[in-house]
């Protein structure tokens, strides 16, 4: 649960019941970036603020989820709340620019994902693997996988174990790992992007 997720939850919890209902209806028709699906109507309409936050983050990841939430709030005329959400999302982000991340356009994007492209460097250079595991837990890692990686004695062996699970991941799952890397070791990601 990162900064963006907390900011989304904050915003949604500050909506009245009527505003939350309106938010959900607008979410059903808001234009989405290519590569993202829509939350099913049936599930969406019955959700409270906490469930909706979780759904937004699982469907759109934290960065785009916050951006989408702000867009809908703006569309509802809640400019100030949208501004506060974006300010909270960007505050203290070490990644450039403001931790913004590309959408998972798996169909449109040829070649290897960043994670696969820089596998060897990530195994050698990631130092805070636990932070990544906590960010991925419950989203792409099961309890057993989480424990298996944590049980490894060194950072490189932890990362090797983590990579043993990635063949089953789709582009969105790999984006979650990239987002976690941007949040924990932005300088490493930037360095690899330049290389």
């Amino acid at each position: 649960m990162g900064r963006a997720r907390d900011a989304i939850l904050d915003a949604l919890e500050n909506l009245t019941a009527e505003e939350l209902k309106k938010f959900k209806l607008k979410l059903l028709s808001v234009p989405l970036r290519e590569g993202y699906g829509r939350i099913p109507r049936g599930a969406l309409l019955s959700m409270d603020a906490l469930d909706l936050t979780d759904k937004l983050v699982s469907f759109y990841l934290e960065t785009y989820g916050a951006e989408l939430t702000a867009n809908v709030l703006r569309d509802m005329g809640l400019q100030e709340m949208a501004g506060q959400l974006q300010a909270a999302t960007h505050q203290g982000s070490g990644a450039a620019p403001a931790g913004i991340q590309a959408p998972p356009q798996s169909a449109a994007k040829p070649g290897l994902h960043f994670i696969d492209q820089h596998r060897a460097a990530l195994i050698a250079r990631v130092t805070n693997v636990e932070w990544l595991l906590d960010a991925l837990y419950g989203k792409v890692l099961t309890d057993e996988q989480y424990q298996a990686v944590r049980a490894e004695p060194t950072n490189p062996s932890k990362m090797r174990k983590l990579f043993s699970f990635t063949p089953a991941w789709n582009w969105t799952c790999k984006d979650l790992l990239l987002q976690a890397l941007r949040e924990s070791q932005s300088y490493l990601v930037e360095d690899l992007e330049r290389s």
Epitope: L50, N128, E130, W131, Y137, G138, E144, Y146, R150
Partner: antibody, heavy 118, light 107 residues
Framework: QVQLQQSGAELARPGASVKMSCKAS????????MHWVKQRPGQGLEWIGY????????YYNQNFKDKATLTADKSSSTAYMQLSNLASDDSAVYYC???????????WGQGTLVTVSA | DIVLTQSPATLSVTPGDSVSLSCRAS??????LHWYQHKSHESPRLLIK???QSISGIPSRFSGSESGTDFTLSINSVETEDFGIYFC?????????FGGGTKLEIK
């Protein structure tokens, strides 16, 4: 808002067992991990273990592996901890705590006091 | 197990003072350190996660920092509602362990 309501105080004999509960509300019970923490009078906190209510997966502190059993009932959004073969050093306040993931505790219950006395 | 040592054990302050509470880990734990506040007759409350990440709903006067194995919780201009026990918790390696706590009391 998120609430964790724990069951009332327990008085037990040495060698007996107790089962305490932690009823969760205000969030989707199966989404997050539930941890249990022990606090003895005048002493620090000890992490006992956690359960993932979605799968029933449990992970224990080795020091409590033979002492505590964690379970969860999805239908009632309630987590349980059973303590077996009670001894005087099991006298403590036991907290349930909601994990944002298995690493940290976002919300805590009010605690259940267990007193073991002959 | 990783040992977390908190100091001082007790800190007596006047409302309006700014204070720093220390938590030292027995080995490197990265930023896998979380801070909680426990007031009498209340449930503990998460203040800071991962050494310095703020928590929604927690006043901005609470902040955290790290330097190697030394972690600091700072309270900028203490208010009367801040008095209680503060403890740290590590999530670097199992089992999770807690510091012994620092009691913040009114001078």
């Amino acid at each position: 808002q998120v609430q964790l309501q724990q069951s009332g105080a327990e008085l037990a004999r040495p060698g007996a067992s107790v089962k305490m509960s932690c009823k969760a509300s205000g969030y989707t019970f199966t989404t997050y991990t539930m941890h249990w923490v022990k606090q003895r009078p005048g002493q620090g906190l000890e992490w006992i273990g956690y359960i993932n209510p979605s799968s029933g997966y449990t992970y224990y502190n080795q020091n409590f592996k033979d002492k505590a059993t964690l379970t969860a009932d999805k239908s009632s959004s309630t987590a349980y901890m059973q303590l077996s073969n009670l001894a005087s050093d099991d006298s403590a306040v036991y907290y349930c705590a909601l994990g944002g993931n298995p690493a940290w505790f976002a919300y805590w219950g009010q605690g259940t006091l267990v007193t073991v006395s002959a | 197990d990783i040992v977390l040592t908190q100091s001082p054990a007790t800190l007596s302050v006047t409302p309006g003072d700014s204070v720093s509470l220390s938590c030292r880990a027995s080995q490197s734990i990265g930023n896998n350190l979380h801070w909680y506040q426990h007031k009498s007759h209340e449930s503990p409350r998460l203040l800071i996660k991962y050494a310095s990440q703020s928590i929604s709903g927690i006043p901005s006067r609470f902040s955290g920092s790290e330097s190697g194995t030394d972690f600091t919780l700072s309270i900028n201009s203490v208010e009367t509602e801040d008095f209680g026990i503060y403890f740290c918790q590590q999530s670097k390696s199992w089992p999770w362990t807690f510091g012994g706590g620092t009691k913040l009391e009114i001078k």
